[in-house]
Structure formats: structure tokens, C-alpha cells
Interface confidence: low
């Protein structure tokens, strides 16, 4: 990070950057490097792509070491072949309403995701796809055996547990928070983001957190038992310290990671939580970053291409972590 030292570049020749990635001078004006892209970790030495209007957002003033590449206010979004202005809302399909915010797209479901408990007037609710309707709707089945009504009602509660939370309605603000996106890296330290308006003034904002689905150095396939095809959540032998651009977590963590499969399925986090992690850097500086911690993983065939950032809106969501991290504030 320190620019006071003599320039030392990793390679004599300029690196070959992937299509659409700019070749830029590092922050010290020394070496030509491939610019970091939206949502990637950035440092003084690893700058963000200026041609896409990105800047390195270091977050908290104290964290001047490592940031996340963020689009400047007002950057447009490209989604499904169309360009949308920052602040513009659109429907990606009949089921999702999306908003472009500074280069990132956040989508919220238009179809009700409610869970319907049995009630006296609807003892056997069932969701069905009706012709000509986009969203599935609840229908009430008559029980074949009238005596079945009794046990079904055991789950019924007077309060509508799954109704909208009135404490989140503020000044006509319908609070909406997208699920956390998939981790930007399949192994090693990456970034996961979401869009929310769950803040005092109902403003859309992006939140980010560090994430690690699995360590890169782990050879997890070796641990798959004979006859099995997957190891969903491998046991971690010893507590680990996380590393982030030369800085090391102050505490050790007995973290859960996701395993691997040998049958073409991929294992991704299913339930997660977000906790602050303090990192100590070689110069003694301490910085605090929010990080995803895995509770459970799921193995499935929905393995979108790693470069398709939008597929993660549909396939690789992470649940169980909608509470404000301070949120985020």
C-alpha cells in the first residue's frame, strides 16, 4: 500500500486484462494493473476502473486500507440488455420490481412471499399457479375427511405472524431489503452486497460485507466419504484467522464453510448471519469490516456462471439475515 518505496512491478510486461477490464496505472503511479471491477476489493495499489465511473469506497473513515469498488453517484446499470439510469425503477419480469442505484441493481419480489397458516375459514391453504396470472395464489382446499379440520387448526394463531411489520412502516416507507447477493468468490475472501431502504429516511443504499464460502487451499473432495457425492458443510479442524490484503483478524473464528460435490452440483451458503470482524494491519491500524458467517449450506444444480452477476438475484440468494447489521444502519 505504501507508495514511498521504489516502484516494483510484479511483471515486466503489462498484464493481459479480461475483455471490458481497463489497464490502468496503480495508485502509486508505478505499475500497470488490471482495474478492479464493481464490488471487488480495492486498495491504493489496486485501483478501481475509472472508465466505468468506479471509485474505491473505504467505508468507515478509519478503514483507509481496503475498500470496495463502488459506482459514483448516478452511475447507470446494464440489466438484461437494457441501460437504466440511477434511481430508475423497472420490472425485470412480472415477479420482480428492480431499481438501479449507482450501478447496482436491487430487486424485490412483487409476488407475495407470505406463508398462510390454516384458519377456521381456510383450514387447508394451498398455493397454485392460475392461468393468466403471474403470481401464485392461495386457494382453500376442502378436506376430504372433515375430521381432519381439528389437527390442521393446531397451527392457527390469531395474530397474523407473517403480515407486514408495522414497525418498519415509516413516513409511508415500505421497507424493502434485497437478499444478500452470492459471494463474489467461490473460494477465498470475496464481497456480498444488498440494496435496502431500511434506514431513517427510507433512502436506497448499498450495503456490503466480506464473505468466504470456503478457503481456496482446502482440498475438500478428499473428505467425501466413499459412496457419497457431496460434503455439504465440512467440519473445520481448527479455529482460523481471516486475512484481508495483508491484515489479519484480531480474533480467531471457528467458522463454517461450504463443501463440494463430485456430481456437478455446487454447494453455496443458505442461511447466513453478518458480524463485524476487526482486522489488524502490519502498521498497527485496526479496521472493522462486516463479514458473512455461514450457518448452513445447500448443494444444488443451480450453478450460474460466475460472471453472471444478475443470476444471483434468482438462484444464489442467502437467507436468514434480513436484520439491520448496525445496518446497515
Amino acid at each position: 500500500q505504501d507508495c514511498s518505496a521504489q516502484c516494483q512491478c510484479a511483471a515486466e510486461a503489462a498484464p493481459h486484462c479480461p475483455a471490458g477490464v481497463s489497464l490502468v496505472l496503480d495508485g502509486c503511479g508505478c505499475c500497470r494493473v488490471c482495474a478492479k471491477q464493481l464490488g471487488e476489493l480495492c486498495t491504493e495499489r489496486d485501483p478501481c476502473d475509472p472508465h466505468k465511473g468506479l471509485f474505491c469506497d473505504f467505508g468507515s473513515p478509519a478503514n483507509r486500507k481496503i475498500g470496495v469498488c463502488t459506482a459514483k453517484d448516478g452511475a447507470p446499470c446494464v440489466f438484461g440488455g437494457s441501460v437504466y439510469r440511477s434511481g430508475e425503477s423497472f420490472q425485470s419480469s412480472c415477479k420482480y420490481q428492480c431499481t438501479c442505484l449507482d450501478g447496482a441493481v436491487g430487486c424485490v419480489p412483487l409476488c407475495s412471499m407470505d406463508v398462510r397458516l390454516p384458519s377456521p375459514d381456510c383450514p387447508f391453504p394451498r398455493r397454485v399457479k392460475l392461468p393468466g396470472k403471474c403470481c401464485e395464489e392461495w386457494v382453500c382446499d376442502e378436506p376430504k375427511d372433515r375430521t381432519a379440520v381439528g389437527p390442521a387448526l393446531a397451527a392457527y394463531r390469531l395474530e397474523d405472524t407473517f403480515g407486514p411489520d408495522p414497525t418498519m412502516m415509516r413516513a409511508n416507507c415500505l421497507v424493502q431489503t434485497t437478499e444478500w447477493s452470492a459471494c463474489s468468490k467461490t473460494c477465498g475472501m470475496g464481497i456480498s452486497t444488498r440494496v435496502t431502504n431500511d434506514n431513517t429516511f427510507c433512502r436506497l443504499e448499498k450495503q456490503s460485507r466480506l464473505c468466504m464460502v470456503r478457503p481456496c487451499e482446502a482440498d475438500l473432495e478428499e473428505n467425501i466419504k466413499k459412496g457419497k457425492k457431496c460434503i455439504r458443510t465440512p467440519k473445520i479442524a481448527k479455529p482460523v484467522k481471516f486475512e484481508l490484503s495483508g491484515c489479519t483478524s484480531v480474533k480467531t473464528y471457528r467458522a463454517k464453510f461450504c463443501g463440494v460435490c463430485t456430481d456437478g452440483r455446487c454447494c453455496t451458503p443458505h442461511r447466513t448471519t453478518t458480524l463485524p470482524v476487526e482486522f489488524k494491519c502490519p502498521d498497527g491500524e485496526i479496521m472493522k469490516k462486516n463479514m458473512m458467517f455461514i450457518k448452513t449450506c445447500a448443494c444444488h444444480y443451480n450453478c450460474p456462471g460466475d460472471n453472471d452477476i444478475f443470476e444471483s438475484l434468482y438462484y444464489r440468494k442467502m437467507y436468514g439475515d434480513m436484520a439491520h447489521h448496525h445496518h446497515h444502519h
Epitope: D73, F201, R203, E205
Partner: antibody
Framework: EVTLKESGPVLVKPTETLTLTCTVS????????VHWIRQPPGKGLEWLGV???????DYNAAFMSRLTISKDTSKSQVVFTMTNMDPVDTATYYC????????WGQGTTVTVSS | ESVVTQPPSVSGAPGQRVTISCRSS?????????ANWVQQLPGTAFKGLIG???NRAPGVPDRFSGSKSGTSASLAITGLQAEDEADYYC?????????FGGGTKLTVLG
């Protein structure tokens, strides 16, 4: 009508722990967060910490190791605890509602002296 | 560490327009700093005027407005009145904490 009222000891000895309570009315602690701010005599405001409506907390880094903020939503009370008090902590302590710091308590003056 | 700077004092005659600046030491003020403005009338409690850069608190007259530009947030008061004489504080949010400015004493002349 929205009101916040701080209560607690007026005098605290050095090294002792200060515990203040902010009792609110006119709104629910599950709808709004509550901040704690202090003002030393003749000086400006210093933000100490906040408990958000969902119970999460953020603290001023300078007081992180000494400060705890908790709440009892059913009693409409927020409790502020600061350990290891020092004469430099002599100030008027305020609680204020989140949402643009729109409503404040009257403040309680705390003197730290042996 | 972030420092938030306000002018110690400003003054204006009744009916005039005054602005109070609130400068962030660590770069541009953005919507994510949720600039807040608080008024302390002499001998009375505090009252929130503006939150989220430009949102007026309930009951605050539209003579008070908030904005941001570059590294500063600003509070503007138009049609200055004698009862506006008070101390004004800004507060900026930095990801995990608020920082208050040192306060500005507004004197209404005449």
C-alpha cells in the same frame, strides 16, 4: 406527544460506573432508535452511541470499551452505562430520538468528583 | 479520524438569509452521511431541524433548509427572525458513528 426523559445520579465518584435511564413516551422503541449525546460545560456536543430500533448498537470508538446501551421496549426505557468514570466525563447527558435527532430529553447533569 | 468543522459564529439582520456550513475533513459529504442539523435555543433543550441532508423534522418551518455540496453540508435560514438566535450543531454519520461539529452561534442583529 413525544417526550424523552433522562434520569440517574447527579454525582459520581471517579472509577465508578454511571447508569442513566431514558424513559420515552409518544413512540415505541421498536419503531425508533435512541442516541446518547453529552455536552461538557461550555463545550459542544459529543455523540456517544445509539441503540437502533431492532436492538443493534453502535458506539463512539473512543468510548467503546466503557459503554453499554440496552433497552427494555415493553417499559419504553433505554439504559446507558459508562464504566470507569473520570472528572473529564463531567457533562450534561442527553438522549435523543433517531430520525434526524428530532426529539431530545432535557438532559441530566452529571458531575464526576471525589 | 473524521473531524467536522463549523464556523464558530454567523450573524444576520432580521429578514436576511444566512447559511451555516458543516465541513467533513475526510472528503465529500454524501447522502450516506445523513447530515443532521440541531438547534439549541438559549436555556432550553435541543430540537432537531434537518435530517438526512435535507428532510425537515415535523413542525420545522420551511425557512430552514438543508443541502450538501462537495465536502460540506449546509443549513440555510431565510427570512431571519429574532427567535432564530441560537446555537446550531451539525452531525455527520460515518458508517458506524456520528460526529458532531463544534457548533455555530447565530446572532440576529438589531
Amino acid at each position: 406527544e413525544v417526550t424523552l426523559k433522562e434520569s440517574g445520579p447527579v454525582l459520581v465518584k471517579p472509577t465508578e460506573t454511571l447508569t442513566l435511564t431514558c424513559t420515552v413516551s409518544g413512540f415505541s422503541l421498536s419503531t425508533f432508535g435512541v442516541h446518547w449525546i453529552r455536552q461538557p460545560p461550555g463545550k459542544g456536543l459529543e455523540w456517544l452511541g445509539v441503540i437502533w430500533r431492532r436492538g443493534g448498537t453502535d458506539y463512539n470508538a473512543a468510548f467503546m470499551s466503557r459503554l453499554t446501551i440496552s433497552k427494555d421496549t415493553s417499559k419504553s426505557q433505554v439504559v446507558f452505562t459508562m464504566t470507569n468514570m473520570d472528572p473529564v466525563d463531567t457533562a450534561t447527558y442527553y438522549c435523543a430520538r433517531d430520525g434526524g435527532f428530532d426529539y431530545w430529553g432535557q438532559g441530566t447533569t452529571v458531575t464526576v468528583s471525589s | 479520524e473524521s473531524v467536522v468543522t463549523q464556523p464558530p459564529s454567523v450573524s444576520g439582520a432580521p429578514g436576511q438569509r444566512v447559511t451555516i456550513s458543516c465541513r467533513s475533513s475526510i472528503g465529500a459529504v454524501t447522502t450516506s452521511n445523513y447530515a443532521n442539523w440541531v438547534q439549541q435555543l438559549p436555556g432550553t433543550a435541543f430540537k432537531g431541524l434537518i435530517g438526512g441532508t435535507s428532510n425537515r423534522a415535523p413542525g420545522v418551518p420551511d425557512r430552514f433548509s438543508g443541502s450538501k455540496s462537495g465536502t460540506s453540508a449546509s443549513l440555510a435560514i431565510t427570512g431571519l427572525q429574532a427567535e432564530d438566535e441560537a446555537d446550531y450543531y451539525c452531525a455527520l454519520w460515518y458508517s458506524t458513528h456520528y460526529v458532531f461539529g463544534g457548533g455555530t452561534k447565530l446572532t440576529v442583529l438589531g
